[in-house]
């Protein structure tokens, strides 16, 4: 828990350089995000494909989309879970991180020093050991997050199932109902190829309790979709006399000394006539 209060931002006096004053873990061990570069990568043949169970959510059901002042978050059902880790990890929510229209490079993880346009996090908790996500969040092996790197490209109808509701959650505290859809559609091609490391929440309280799976391949959203994400939301309440745009809500990459990131893939990506294979 924070030493006093829970105010934090991505910019200004309460920005990430100050997080550790109120949230000591933010200045501690195993911090995320990180840069994924060749020197720290090691192939691990035991990293088998994950199975995504219960990800196909019925449109007959309503799921709450919330502007929490830091991101836009979609609540997920507890019977949605990942199979293939040491324990069952049940879903709790997904959210996004992004940049701004003038610098649309707002992913949290970077690859060889390069940011992607945005990043999706699907947060799960260890439901074999803990009753809910908040209990699990400060426990060892408590959380597992799937990270999807997002680049600008073609229109993505699956992501639009979230983005089309942004106008109803423009201000902090606002909530909207979203019809269920297949969350697996938000994942990239070849989900068997991923990076794996032990790290932390990328937001306060920065608990070092996250098993990270960062998919190797990005997904694409259109320039218009990215712009909607970068311009639709505010960090402040509707009646705040000093509105703040929700932009650049990503943490800088953290030091990653004397540790390794494990990969489920070994081959180097090579250029072919059709592009990157």
């Amino acid at each position: 828990a924070p030493v006093n209060g829970s105010k934090w931002t991505y910019f200004g006096p309460d920005g990430e350089n100050s997080w550790s004053k109120k949230y000591p873990s933010c200045g501690g061990l195993l911090q995320s995000p990180i840069d994924l570069h060749s020197d720290i990568l090691q192939y691990d043949a035991s990293l088998t494909p994950l199975e995504f169970q219960g990800y196909n959510l019925s449109a007959n059901k309503q799921f709450l989309l919330t502007n929490n002042g830091h991101s836009v978050k979609l609540n997920l059902p507890s019977d949605m879970h990942i199979q293939g880790l040491q324990s069952r990890y049940s879903a709790t929510q997904l959210h996004l991180h992004w940049g701004n229209p003038n610098d649309p490079h707002g992913s949290e993880h970077t690859v060889s020093g390069q940011h992607f346009a945005a990043e999706l996090h699907i947060v799960h908790y260890n439901s074999d050991l803990y009753p809910d996500a908040s209990t699990a969040s400060n426990k060892s092996e408590g959380l597992a997050v799937l990270a999807v790197l997002i680049e600008m490209g073609s229109f993505n109808p699956s992501y639009d199932k979230i983005f089309s509701h942004l106008q109803h959650v423009k201000y902090k505290g606002q909530e909207a109902f979203v019809p269920g859809f297949n969350i697996e559609e938000l994942l990239p091609e070849r989900t068997a190829e991923y990076y794996r490391y032990r790290g932390s929440l990328t937001t306060p309280p920065c608990n070092p309790t996250v098993l990270w799976t960062v998919f190797r391949n990005p997904v694409q959203i259109s320039q218009e979709q990215l712009l909607a994400l970068e311009t639709a939301l505010y960090c402040t309440h509707m009646d705040d006399p000093s509105p703040r745009e929700m932009i650049n809500n990503f943490r800088q990459v953290q030091k990653f000394d004397e540790r390794l990131v494990y990969t489920s893939f070994s081959q180097v990506q090579v250029c072919t006539a059709a592009g990157l294979s």
């Epitope: 007959n60 059901k61 309503q62 059902p77 019977d79 109803h168 109902f177 019809p179």
Partner: antibody, heavy 121, light 106 residues
Framework: EVQLVESGGGLVQPGGSLRLSCAAS????????IYWVRQAPGKGLEWVGY????????TYNQKFKGRATISVDKSKNTAYLQMNSLRAEDTAVYYC??????????????WGQGTLVTVSS | DIQMTQSPSSLSASVGDRVTITCRAS?????MHWYQQKPGKAPKPWIY???DLISGVPSRFSGSGSGTDFTLTISSLQPEDFATYYC?????????FGQGTKVEIK
Amino acid sequence: EVQLVESGGGLVQPGGSLRLSCAASGYSYTDYNIYWVRQAPGKGLEWVGYIDPANGDTTYNQKFKGRATISVDKSKNTAYLQMNSLRAEDTAVYYCSRPIYYGAYWYFDVWGQGTLVTVSS
Amino acid sequence: DIQMTQSPSSLSASVGDRVTITCRASSSVTYMHWYQQKPGKAPKPWIYRTSDLISGVPSRFSGSGSGTDFTLTISSLQPEDFATYYCQQWSSNPLTFGQGTKVEIK
């Protein structure tokens, strides 16, 4: 035939609690959320909260958070609404209802007959 | 919360009259839904997604609108139409209903 049937209404003392039941039949119970909506005498409709019978996940109208608890017994195809610290203003007909998704949005296609709760000493 | 204001709250009309009920939302909503309720009965779905009639609802009913302003219109009022009509939005949490418009016989 798809049916929702509420029960458990009656006279309750101020400060007391109620537990209402909503028994469903005629459809695959876990495929739809169950909502509780109330209507004070001569007044409009007010949403209390809902439950996903597949997993027990609940969402509440902020106005009722902490005072209302919705639960489910899948084996009985029945949802429950428990409300505590009742006041005279909680006097209402309580309905359960099922939303269905059709053509890009939901509407409440099935309603129970309602059960009247009167809070009075 | 999105407040839903229906007007009028009640109206008296004769069989054959054209009746218009309006519903104004305090913020923009994607769609409006309408329910009909008769005394002592549960509400019935009547119009969904602003303008689509529920199966079995007579074609004299219509719905229209967008953003914050929506209407339910009865082109030629019939005896069975005397009831209370509620609008409802599902765009924002909490989902909210209008206070109702009671259509009475003149």
